[in-house]
């Protein structure tokens, strides 16, 4: 149990106050993290509070400003990037968001040697992506869907691709679906380790159906936004991978990397690219039916000037119980021999663990094992492997960092973080310098987050980078809710839950219950992290109990739970929320006449289905930007879990799992439906169809749209949204305003 002390003593009671909605909307209790921008084994850059870019040397203890805030301000820079030879810095300004990761910006190059901006052959604007080579100061950038190369910042550019066209051909950047559902990046180009080669993806969206929606803006006529967006079963992007020699790019030109034959025989995806050496690259491919993944290691053949991907260097990963991987197929981390690698995939017991692959996947050596999961491999050095897992004390919602000594036999395992600040810190990530000489640990909770710097050899803490003292002081007179993380055992299923309880919680009283749900495949809501957010306010000020439950389909507890929802989305996720609610009622402190559920995105889908389950458990609920039919959502995501919406595959469940099919069941609940009209991700179409079905069924409901807002409902819409939802819940629970 993790109890957040409310620090309420009778003598102090009058000085303590509850959280207000204003606190949440103003971000009064937000925390800071410190991620060093590593530039060597012992040096990192950090942007100081006054916006100077400062270089820190851990070993000498010295720091100096490499770029002043005055220079940053001169071009209104919001971001920077130092060239590896430390001669130049790019400054990024005019940030303009596109989708989740993508944005365009204006870039200026500053010459540190003469303290001036590089004049002549300036970069065009706006640029879609820009990056330095890993060595020296070559620049690759994407402008108007084409890739350009500069040998030096002041040089004229060399145009690598010429076929880029808006919404048709994307070079070096992903299209919408690859950005959101496959790569999770704004870029699709990768430098080789020493900058000899540049690999890039070309996405051809010519035949993809287009989603079109109105953007109202301020003009007399709305604009129409068109995005090539493959929904389930639709035509997908065609991807090709090319590599160009950046030393003499005009000679051979881009060379296409061959797709493994077993992948190329039907529709497929490219899932990631990992450089091993300057002349060895590893590509990962995935069949459209996403239960077969192929990892292909390719070598540069100097004599042929081409890339060779021998069948003997193809490694197949297949799932017989679900889809390949977790949310994504994991990526390999290569060892120093440049051919063997470490990778996370399911072991024979159905838990995701680290394996060492030297020749074939069949002969893989399992490095970690147990009824828990390895989550991320951070770094492999010659003698150590650093990874995170949720092994410690069997809490799936924790993350600790471990070191396995791979230089010695048998390998020994050490938990680096488990006992550092045990009460405060149970959920870590890490950031390593070159050769893991030093690393930063960032602890996200359950206590107030703290970032620390450590010696990579001894694991000794060197210094605190950020401890959020101001936040700690600000919270001293706040009545925070209590939090507990526990589990329910139901029909051989373990349901972990987090319960957020009002500060003066009394088990003998009855409280209204709000379920917050996400529930998407391979997600996790029950995590030992710190947060002061809307639900904290609802518990602190409005006296609600809030619960989050990780049911079937959620991650890091083994394949049985994860793959339970395979081809059956919308069934078990809902069942498990309902089961948990029944168990909470049995605990005796829930007012069963005042139970609500809310969720966003996938959570909006689950909350809608839960409200329409016909159980009579829920009085009211809210769906924000919900999916309403899997036929409306992106192919890459949807088909991973649902297969294809065809008669000979899974069309029947696609049809049975819609929210619209259950319109009649909303008659006895209060339903608030919310969506942004410019949602590029879960299209407004989803809520429009729910609303139409409810109208056709003559079912009353409440709705709110946010004009020109996307899936995140940001800015002033956020304030309006949470204020509106608060009023709705307070009305539902008969709480006075």
């Amino acid at each position: 149990i993790v109890l957040r002390p409310s620090r309420v003593h009778n003598s102090e009671e009058n000085t303590m106050r509850a959280l207000t909605l204003k606190d949440i909307l103003n971000g009064t209790f937000s925390y800071k993290t410190f991620f060093p921008n590593w530039i060597s084994g012992q040096e990192y850059l950090h942007q100081s509070a006054d916006n100077n870019i400062v270089l820190y040397n851990i070993e000498t203890g010295q720091s100096y400003t490499i770029l002043s805030n005055r220079t940053m301000k001169s071009v209104n820079a919001s971001n920077y990037g130092l060239s590896p030879d430390r001669q130049f810095v790019y400054l990024e300004s005019d940030y303009s968001k596109l989708w989740r990761y993508s944005y365009t910006a204006t870039y200026y190059i500053y010459d540190l040697s003469n303290g001036e901006f590089v004049r002549g052959n300036e970069l065009p604007r706006p640029i879609q992506y820009l990056c330095w080579s890993p060595v020296g100061s070559k620049l690759a950038y994407v402008y108007q869907n084409n890739i350009y190369l500069k040998q030096r910042p002041g040089d004229p550019p060399f145009q690598i691709t010429f076929n880029g066209r808006e919404n048709k051909i994307f070079n070096g950047i992903p299209d919408w679906v690859y950005e959101e559902e496959m790569l999770a990046t704004k870029y699709a180009l990768w430098w080789s380790p020493n900058g000899k080669f540049l690999a890039y993806a070309e996405f051809n969206d010519t035949d993809i159906p287009v989603i079109a929606y109105s953007y109202y803006g301020d003009e007399q006529y709305p604009r129409t936004i068109n995005i090539p967006y493959p929904k389930a079963g639709a035509k997908n992007p065609v991807v090709r991978i090319f590599i160009i020699d950046t030393t003499y790019p005009a000679y051979v030109g881009p060379q296409e990397v061959p797709v493994p034959a077993m992948i190329a025989s039907s529709d497929y995806y490219f899932s990631w690219l990992t450089w091993v050496t300057d002349e060895r690259v590893c590509l990962q491919w995935l069949k459209r039916v996403q239960n077969v993944s192929v990892l292909s290691i390719c070598d540069f053949r100097e004599d042929w000037q081409t890339w060779d991907c021998p069948k003997t260097q193809e490694h197949i990963e297949e799932s017989r119980t679900g889809w390949a991987g977790g949310f994504f197929v994991s990526t390999p981390v290569f060892s120093y021999d440049a051919i063997s690698y470490y990778k996370i995939f399911s072991d024979k017991d159905g838990y995701k663990h680290i394996h060492y692959i030297k020749d074939t996947v069949e002969n893989a050596i399992q490095i970690t094992s147990g009824k828990w999961e390895a989550i991320n491999i951070f770094r492999v050095t010659q003698d150590s492997l650093f990874y995170s897992s949720n092994e410690f004390e069997e809490y799936p919602g924790r993350r600790n960092i471990y070191r396995i000594s791979i230089g010695s036999y048998p390998p020994s395992k050490k938990c680096v973080t488990c006992h550092l600040r045990k009460e405060r810190c149970q959920y870590y990530t890490a950031s390593f310098s070159d050769y893991a000489k030093y690393y930063a640990l960032v602890c996200y909770g359950p206590g107030i987050p703290i970032s620390t710097l450590h010696d990579g050899r001894t694991d000794q803490e060197i210094k605190i980078l950020e401890e959020n003292k101001e936040l700690e002081n600000a919270l001293k007179n706040i009545q925070l809710p209590k939090e507990e993380i526990k589990k329910l055992e139901v029909d051989e299923i373990t349901l972990w839950y987090k319960m957020i309880l009002p500060p003066q919680f009394d088990r003998s009283k009855k409280y209204p219950l709000l379920i917050q749900v996400y529930g998407g495949p391979c997600s996790q809501s029950v995590r030992s992290v710190f947060a002061v957010n809307w639900i904290s306010y609802l518990a602190s000020k409005e006296g609600m109990v809030i619960a989050l439950v990780d049911g079937r389909g959620t991650a890091f507890q083994g394949d049985k739970l994860l793959y339970a929802v395979y081809r059956k989305l919308g069934v078990y996720e809902v069942e498990d929320q309902i089961t948990a609610v029944r168990k909470f009622i049995e605990m005796g402190f829930i007012d069963e006449k005042r139970i609500a559920i809310w969720g966003w995105s996938y959570g909006g889908y689950v909350s809608s289905l839960a409200l329409a389950s016909g159980t009579g458990l829920f009085k009211c609920g809210i769906a924000v930007a919900p999916v309403s039919s899997w036929e409306y959502y992106a192919s890459v995501y949807t088909e991973r879990f649902m297969g294809l919406p065809t008669k000979d595959d899974n069309l029947e469940h696609y049809k049975n799992s819609t929210v619209m099919a259950r319109a009649e069941y909303f008659r006895n609940v209060d339903y608030l439906l919310i969506h942004g009209t410019a949602d590029d991700n879960v299209h407004f179409q989803n809520s429009a169809q729910i609303a139409k079905a409810l109208v056709n069924a003559q079912v009353d409901f409440q709705a709110m749209w946010y004009s020109d807002q996307n899936h995140g409902l940001s800015g002033l819409s956020t304030n309006h949204l949470y204020t509106h939802m608060t009023h709705f819940l307070k009305q539902c629970f008969s709480l006075s305003d």
Epitope: N121, Y248, P249, A250, G253
Partner: antibody, heavy 117, light 108 residues
């Protein structure tokens, strides 16, 4: 030994067509970008067209765009240049060269195209 | 397009002398994209220099290249009888690739 052998040149009337071929041997043709470069009698070199290894990228000089088409058959180790709507100013020796946009390291001996009425 | 202007048009020198050929670009060219070729009468061109200064395979070390930006130079340190030919510079920085008009090195 690397060899590039052009063929298909000859005399043609203005407005006519010709198809030049370039047979390659001694290197991995399928992984080499190729170009056509021409030289009018007594004049300098002029790049005409280029094609990437698998034919997905093709480029043309403005003077021939819309009239000439570069292509390749990797199974036959052959490069082609289809020339339509020929004009007197297209008269030149046409070389096929190994390379994309520069560093043309191997050249054929050339084939003469004469456009005249 | 990038225009390359070579000078002089003709260079009359004796064997054993040093030849300095100039190539000026109408706009900046990265060194990586500048090459030099030699062409003898009735023959195809031959690649001499890539990346402004790197000799191609089999090219004797009396040939050297230098320069950057818009000014590039090909130097033949001691002319041999077989070096009398036409020399072309070429850029592959921008499509279309372009050649200079050539410098003829003739026997004085």
């Amino acid at each position: 030994e690397v060899q590039l052998l052009e063929s298909g040149g000859g005399l043609v009337q203005p407005g006519g067509s010709l198809r030049l071929s370039c047979a390659a041997s001694g290197f991995t043709f399928s992984s080499s970008a190729m170009s056509w470069v021409r030289q009018a009698p007594g004049k300098g070199l002029e790049w005409v067209s280029a094609i990437s290894t698998n034919g997905n990228y093709t480029y043309y000089a403005d003077s021939v765009k819309g009239r000439f088409t570069i292509s390749r058959d990797n199974s036959k180790n052959t490069l082609y240049l289809q020339m339509n709507s020929l004009r007197a100013e297209d008269t030149a020796v046409y070389y096929c060269a190994k390379g994309w946009l520069g560093n043309f390291d191997y050249w054929g001996q050339g084939t003469l195209v004469t456009v005249s009425s | 397009e990038i225009v390359l202007t070579q000078s002089p048009g003709t260079l009359s020198l004796s064997p054993g002398e040093r030849a300095t050929l100039s190539c000026r670009a109408s706009q900046s060219v990265s060194r990586s994209y500048l090459a030099w070729y030699q062409q003898k009468p009735g023959q195809a061109p031959r690649l001499l220099i890539i990346g402004a200064s790197t000799r191609a395979t089999g090219i004797p070390d009396r040939f050297s290249g230098s320069g950057s930006g818009t000014d590039f130079t090909l130097t033949i340190s001691r002319l041999e009888p077989e070096d009398f030919a036409v020399y072309y510079c070429q850029q592959g920085q921008v499509i279309p690739p372009t050649f200079g008009q050539g410098t003829k090195v003739e026997i004085k």
